[in-house]
């Protein structure tokens, strides 16, 4: 329990007085909090976060859902935190099986566990295939599996967080990675046509294709000098991952001279913009 | 217990802009990501984008880019929509919306957006 | 786009009866069996309220009336036996793939 010198606000203290508690399924959970100031209790994990005004923690029935960290806060903001397991062989882990991985980051398999004496809490491929050769990890029983620098090639991989009990693997249930990409390039695009001659009530149809690796790219259509909103549409196709592919095709029904100009397709990523024009001409 | 609150309605006049909150307790903010669903008689349920945990990214339906931006201020737990050169095809509901374990498992109550002149 | 078709767009069911919504998806939702679909109720004035998640499980809170199955393309919500509180309009919604896309609704009415 944390020591300060007197006349200096002082955390709470908790009891009893560890960093981490195991309990077994059905027991009771008892802290409790003592401080002149005391103000909550706050209990966290993965799903959500509640709160207790009573300066004694008590669950009658403890649940494996009440795992977590349980948090006391006095009136000058100061906390002191114990870590409560509850122990339930018939549920290892606590799972939120959203799983995004930003390319080149790192991002957490949310499996903590409910057991920390269990061993060999690690990652495991569905089905028995093997992780990735260069995926690397790094187990955390109170928050999950950190995955570390995510690749592009992880994209949809599916995975269990896996301990050994008594000498047999358990496995969570799946984990299905969806990596979004990092643009490492300007959007590719290009027109169908680079300049039109057409009589008045012609129709003007022009395309513009963009290629890029996600459908986060913004793409648009816009006239030179003017800022009115083109109407245009779309037809997209995902030719795999990470090949994304929009062609946006702007519309005049009916031509007429004053339409005459230069008409640019404008993309945009993360990384950069590209462009690329048509110029339109509308004679008598 | 988890809570999104918006505010009820909005009233904006063509061309303008609104920035529409959604304010988050109950849970850790910066856990989840928020996603904003726009709901109009016509179109019913459409998603505009996500704000993702943590780091902020964004990630839009092309529909929605360059009209909705998302942000959110991790110190108040609160998630931003800014929709900007309003139109009447605009007007509608919209809703955030929290990502737990796969699916959208609490929603704000919504908030109605009217664009009059 | 993955366009999500709800049929039928409204339906009158009588008290006790069952109800079945169907969703056809334009691909598939499935990834390693896991299918990505999910079934809101929405009653006028109120947010959607998640029902059923990844096809076939059952959200904390809901009545066991409701259930959900299907996988790859084709989905259904069953409700059996219906009860006068379950009138409202249902949606099924993919998160398989960006962008994320909603049926266009099924408007349930109990005779």
């Known amino acids: 329990q944390p020591s300060v010198s007197p006349g200096e606000p002082s955390p709470p203290s908790i009891h009893p007085g560890k960093s981490d508690l195991i309990v077994r399924v059905g027991d009771e959970i008892r802290l409790l909090c003592t401080d002149p100031g005391f103000v909550k209790w706050t209990f966290e994990i993965l799903d959500e976060t509640n709160e207790n005004k009573q300066n004694e923690w008590i669950t009658e029935k403890a649940e494996a859902t009440n795992t977590g960290k349980y948090t006391c806060t006095n009136k000058h903001g100061l906390s002191n935190s114990i870590y409560v397991f509850v122990r339930d062989p018939a549920k290892l882990f606590l799972v939120d099986r959203s799983l995004y991985g930003k390319e080149d980051n790192d991002t957490l398999v949310r499996c903590p566990l409910t057991d920390p004496e269990v061993t060999n809490y690690s990652l495991k491929g569905c089905q028995g295939k093997p992780l990735p050769k260069d995926l690397r990890f790094i187990p955390d029983p109170k928050a999950g599996i950190m995955i570390k620098s995510v690749k592009r090639a992880y994209h949809r991989l599916c995975l269990h967080c896996s301990v050994d009990q008594e000498g047999k693997s358990v496995l969570s249930e799946k984990f299905i990675l969806k990596v979004r990409p990092a643009f490492k390039a300007v959007p590719v695009v290009s027109v169908s046509k680079a300049s039109y001659l057409l009589r008045e009530g012609e129709e003007f149809t022009v395309t513009c294709t963009i290629k890029d690796v996600s459908s986060s790219v913004y793409s648009t259509w816009k006239r030179e000098n003017s800022q009115t909103k083109l109407q245009e549409k779309y037809n997209v196709w995902h030719h795999g991952d990470f090949n994304y592919e929009r062609q946006a095709t702007l519309t005049i029904s009916s031509a007429r001279v004053n339409d005459s100009g230069v008409f640019m397709c404008y993309a945009n990523n993360t990384f950069g913009s590209a462009n690329v024009t048509t110029t339109l001409e509308v004679v008598d | 217990q988890v809570q999104l609150q918006q505010p009820g309605a909005e009233l904006v006049k063509p061309g303008a802009s609104v920035k529409m909150s959604c304010k988050a307790s109950?849970?850790?903010?910066?856990?989840?990501?928020m996603h904003w669903v726009k709901q109009t008689p016509g179109q019913g349920l459409e998603w505009i984008g996500v704000?993702?945990?943590?780091?902020?990214?964004?990630s839009y339906n092309q529909k929605f880019k360059g009209k909705a931006t998302l942000t959110a201020d991790k110190s108040s737990s609160t998630a931003y929509m800014q929709i900007n050169s309003l139109t009447s095809e605009d007007s509608a509901v919209y809703y955030c919306?929290?990502?737990?374990?796969?699916?959208?498992?609490?929603w704000g109550q919504g908030t109605l957006v009217t664009v009059s002149a | 786009n993955i366009v999500l078709t709800q049929s039928p767009a409204s339906l009158a069911v009588s008290l006790g009866l069952r109800a079945t919504i169907s969703c056809r998806a334009s691909?598939?939702?499935?990834?390693?069996?896991?299918?990505?679909m999910h079934w809101y109720q929405q009653k006028p004035g109120q947010p959607p309220k998640l029902l059923i998640y990844?096809?076939?499980n059952l959200e904390s809170g809901v009545p066991a009336r409701f259930s959900g199955s299907g996988s790859r393309t084709d989905f259904t919500l069953t409700i059996d036996p219906v009860e006068a509180d379950d009138a409202a309009t249902y949606y099924c919604?993919?998160?398989?793939?960006?962008?994320?896309?909603f049926g266009g609704g099924t408007k349930l009415e109990i005779k």
């Open positions: 109950g849970y850790t903010f910066t856990s989840y990501n």
């Open positions: 990844l096809a076939s």
């Open positions: 691909e598939s939702v499935d990834i390693y069996g896991n299918s990505f």
């Open positions: 919306a929290r990502e737990r374990d796969t699916r959208f498992g609490n």
């Open positions: 704000i993702y945990s943590g780091n902020g990214d964004t």
């Open positions: 919604q993919q998160n398989n793939e960006d962008p994320y896309t």
